[in-house]
């Protein structure tokens, strides 16, 4: 014969453990049900009564089977650098990440508590590392023979133009101007692979809070006004 | 010029613990990110993690990530990846590689090799 | 982890020849593919970046192309120095990875 099947509560056989989605109340000493997500313990159950559940309130939630007293409150809402990526509802708390242009510079366990704008190189330097969803923009030099005109979160530096004939040389910062005749892009004078010096350290101006456009968080950027800045994965 | 100029090679035992160095030389090693990268014989190229000088941030492969320590010394212009517990598949070239604002590795150490035998 | 996969392993072509090397990607990386040329006893050095991009100094018989999930890299004239190993390198995603390599030989 098949064993009979035990319904809630019951007291377990010694040295056994309660079934999936059952606890043991140590009060009652039985094994009893546990609330679903979405459900909290509303009256815990005794040796002749299951346990009660009852529906999370609004702007509260439970994730786990569970037989907690009273349900998670959902967090704040948004700021306003950050975006909702999962709304508060009964089974699941609100999330929200940073907003484009910005990244988590203080994290919680699920989203981000703190975001902040991504740094954006100056002139004469360009995104040595992009921003990812956690991590800033690392700006540095740009190499000989490359450039970037730009104050920008997303621009590595690009190849100076090739001229026929040069009006004025490209440097770190400014492109390279050819006299009337058509110039190519083939290949940069110069094989040293080294930075240009710079006069001053400072490799990026003061993060703003309006980026002037949405990150690339790929690790190389688009030349000149080619296709837009990709997304990444990040890390 | 720009030199990116390694220790010499080094013979270590399994368990053991190996430091490099990488100097960089005729530019300030914060004008760059540093990365390391493995070439075990015969084999492809694998990347370890990198440093920047300027803050002393780090971002490792989670491969390396329990026994690699990336760091930067920038009053000599020299930066150091150290392997701790070592293994006989270990045994590989180690490169340094600097990262411009180009963002791709513009420039290369000449490489240390490094063999673990007991 | 994305995972570069260079083809042929070898490849074995004349000199003056045109040779093109390929590397897919595992998944989208969009433009952020690196080649690197290899040489024995040597460094790598940086041929292309952002796919299509020719680093400082790299003659112009070399070219890159593609995006998403499929890279070429093509030498359009082989000279005898361009008998090398070739590695793409994806740069979208941590880990940054490597293809496996690709050996061009003189026919």
């Known amino acids: 014969l098949p064993a009979q099947v035990a319904f809630t509560p019951y007291a377990p056989e010694p040295g056994s453990t309660c079934r999936l989605r059952e606890y043991y109340d140590q009060t009652a000493q039985m094994c009893c049900s546990k609330c679903s997500p979405g459900q909290h313990a509303k009256v815990f159950c005794t040796k002749t009564s299951d346990t009660v559940c009852d529906s999370c309130e609004d702007s509260t939630y439970t994730q786990l089977w569970n037989w907690v007293p009273e349900c998670l409150s959902c967090g704040s809402r948004c700021s306003s650098d950050q975006v909702e990526t999962q709304a508060c509802t009964r089974e699941q708390n609100r999330i929200c990440t940073c907003r484009p242009g910005w990244y988590c510079a203080l994290s919680k366990q699920e989203g981000c508590r703190l975001c902040a704008p991504l740094r954006k190189c100056r002139p004469g330097f360009g995104v040595a590392r992009p921003g990812t969803e956690t991590s800033d923009v690392v700006c540095k030099p740009c190499a000989p023979g490359t450039f970037s005109n730009t104050t920008s979160s997303t621009d590595i530096c690009r190849p100076h133009q090739i001229c026929n004939v040069v009006a004025i040389p490209g440097n770190a910062s400014m492109d390279a101007v050819c006299t009337s005749t058509s110039p190519t892009r083939s290949m940069a004078p110069g094989a040293v692979h080294l930075p240009q010096p710079v006069s001053t350290r400072s490799q990026h101006t003061q993060p703003t809070p309006e980026p002037s456009t949405a990150p690339s968080t790929s690790f190389l950027l688009p030349m000149g006004p080619s296709p837009p800045a990709e997304g990444s994965t990040g890390d | 010029e720009v030199q990116l100029v390694q220790s010499g090679a080094e013979v270590k035992k399994p368990g053991a613990t190996v430091k490099i160095s990488c100097k960089v030389s005729g530019y300030s090693i914060t004008d760059y990110l540093l990365h390391w990268v493995q070439q075990a014989p015969g084999k492809g190229l694998e990347w370890m993690g990198w440093i920047d000088p300027e803050d002393a941030k780090t971002k490792y492969g989670q491969k390396f990530q329990s026994r690699v320590t990336i760091t930067a010394d920038t009053s000599t212009d020299t930066a150091y990846m150290e392997l701790s517990s070592l293994r006989s598949e270990d045994t590989a070239v180690y490169y340094c590689a600097a990262n411009s604002g180009t963002g791709t590795m513009d420039a290369w150490g000449q490489g240390t090799l490094v063999t673990v035998s007991s | 982890d994305i995972v570069m996969t260079q083809s042929p392993a070898t490849l074995s072509v004349s000199p003056g020849e045109r040779a093109t090397l390929s590397c897919k990607a595992s998944q989208n990386v969009g433009s952020n593919v690196d080649w690197y040329q290899q040489k024995p006893g040597q460094s790598p050095r940086v041929l292309i970046y952002?796919?299509?991009i020719r680093y400082t100094g790299i003659p112009a018989r070399f070219s890159g192309s593609g995006s998403g999930t499929e890279f070429t890299l093509t030498i359009s004239i082989l000279q005898s120095e361009d008998f090398a190993v070739y590695f793409c390198m994806q740069s979208k995603s941590y880990p940054i990875t490597f293809g496996q390599g690709t050996k061009l030989e003189i026919k």
């Open positions: 952002k796919a299509s």
